[in-house]
Amino acid sequence: SGVFQLQLQEFVNERGVLASGRPCEPGCRTFFRVCLKHFQAVVSPGPCTFGSVSTPVLGTNSFAVRDDSSGGGRNPLQLPFNFTWPGTFSLIIEAWHAPGDDLRPEALPPDALISKIAIQGSLAVGQNWLLDEQTSTLTRLRYSYRVICSDNYYGDNCSRLCKKRNDHFGHYVCQPDGNLSCLPGWTGEYCQQPICLSGCHEQNGYCSKPAECLCRPGWQGRLCNECIPHNGCRHGTCSTPWQCTCDEGWGGLFCDQDLNYCTHHSPCKNGATCSNSGQRSYTCTCRPGYTGVDCELELSECDSNPCRNGGSCKDQEDGYHCLCPPGYYGLHCEHSTLSCADSPCFNGGSCRERNQGASYACECPPNFTGSNCEKKVDRCTSNPCANGGQCLNRGPSRMCRCRPGFTGTYCERHVSDCARNPCAHGGTCHDLESGLMCTCPAGFSGRRCEVRTSIDACASSPCFNRATCYTDLSTDTFVCNCPYGFVGSRCEFPVGLPPS
């Protein structure tokens, strides 16, 4: 598709005569008829196969033609065509005299013709005008002509359609030959593919507009070359997406188990020494005078009940002092001045004389002790409960209240967290101080092996044409994410897109 343009420049008819030699009255009011047709060695009358056009009256006798609209006509004259330009043509230009206002052929007498010229030849498409001048005995016509392509048509024959665009379907302008020239930042056959930020990781990154670098799931950073740790990860990093590699001092699947509780929490009080003893556990070694799990309790010298025979204990700066009841003396009121005659045995204890009545001994009933049966038996003094269990006096006996995870009369047995078979899908259970841990068989993960994970379906690199491979965890199969221009389950088929 294109346009044959004819620019009339000057017409000379000094004598103001018709082709017949007869003069025009009062002068030759001149207009032109142009006929464009296929190449003919000898130009003959017949249909104007490439088009025709007429002008209004442009002047009288001799005149120059302006380069614009003249009296409603256009200069240059436009002869559009909607076919491939063949490169050759025939052109007939007739000058006519218009006695009245009606310029239709049927309204004019045949002898109103002033002159007729016919040319033929080759003409390539181009912007340059070809200047020509045709002279007869009485007239002269100077004109120029060219063939140019219509908007959006390019090439030697105006046969290549190319419409510049900057939208989802392409980002390009058109070269003179009709080839696409991508706008900056775009590439591909139809300039639909953005050129990502320089250095953007080929597999982990992509872009939807030029100089962008967007990361695929699991990757981060300007160039998408840094991984993102697992959602549940607390104190860890990664070297591949969704990993959780623990920072120093942390353990467990999500690095949430504190292996360095002493440093992170300083639980031991009053200058005690802290020792890490596994995940989230520790032991405090108390300084003299302190007790408790965290050495938070101050010891009293009287706490050990050193005074015998009902003596009362008083704390002092440098220790303690026993105030003895009547009939007793000594540092701990351990010596008696009494005999059985003084009924020294309390709580139903029976008295036995010793050393010919110089001293005595009390035989105490159950639940009582002391040289005078004055003390109720505390069966917890020996700290019989293991693993931090709490000792409780229960009449003639004692019992241990165990911490979670322990059992037995003296809390001496660790309750196995594995007893209830918590690991799913054939996972192996391990008892740890902090709880249990499951070792999962291939294809499963999670704290209890409850998450089905894929055997890497992408390991065999099944995707073609640099497609990205993902594993479908629900079916253990691969999914190929095709780059632009390819389709198929393995991105194996190229897509042939027509020009849009």
Epitope: R216, E226, P229
Partner: antibody, heavy 118, light 107 residues
Amino acid sequence: EVQLVESGGGLVQPGRSMKLSCAASGFTFRNFPMAWVRQAPTRGLEWVATISSSDGTTYYRDSVKGRFTISRDNAKSTLYLQVNSLRSEDTATYYCSRGYYNSPFAYWGQGTLVTVSS
Amino acid sequence: DIQMTQSPASLSASLGETVTIECRASEDIYSNLAWYQQKPGNSPQLLIFDTNNLADGVPSRFSGSGSGTQSSLKINSLQSEDVASYFCQQYNNYPPTFGGGTKLELK
């Protein structure tokens, strides 16, 4: 226990600025990308901005680009959102969250309400 | 941007019932989908990621499934503490986008 505590919200006039903060604890802050997500009754949940942990690369939703700035201080385990040229459509509860634009938002703060009104 | 369409917008169910919430993406999101639960007056909490993986501490009565553009969240044996709004979110394409939410109430 992971904790994210937002602050800095309140009533502000259109065109004005404010700075939201989010104090993080219970995880190693410097290791994780962070994000702001907002929730308005009319528009539901909307991702607002993201910052990577590795190099501090930032991303924003189109409607806030050039007005909002996300930043982080790893030494203080704190995430920030500087909001400028506020509009009535920015009225929402702003949540601080651990996550990127291409990962789930694993943990969320309790939110801070920003009301833009004259 | 990828559009996420959740259905239904609200639903009522009885205790012990099984409930299913659907989420449709405007294009393939390759299983990069999460579900969140938001109880009244609280912030959202991650329930499920990568379409079918349960987040830490989430009860096993919750499950997720789907592929391509269709995903669903299933709650078996509904409990009173499950009364909340539920949101889906895709993180396959930039920017991440959320569904409009489903409000779950007790009958």
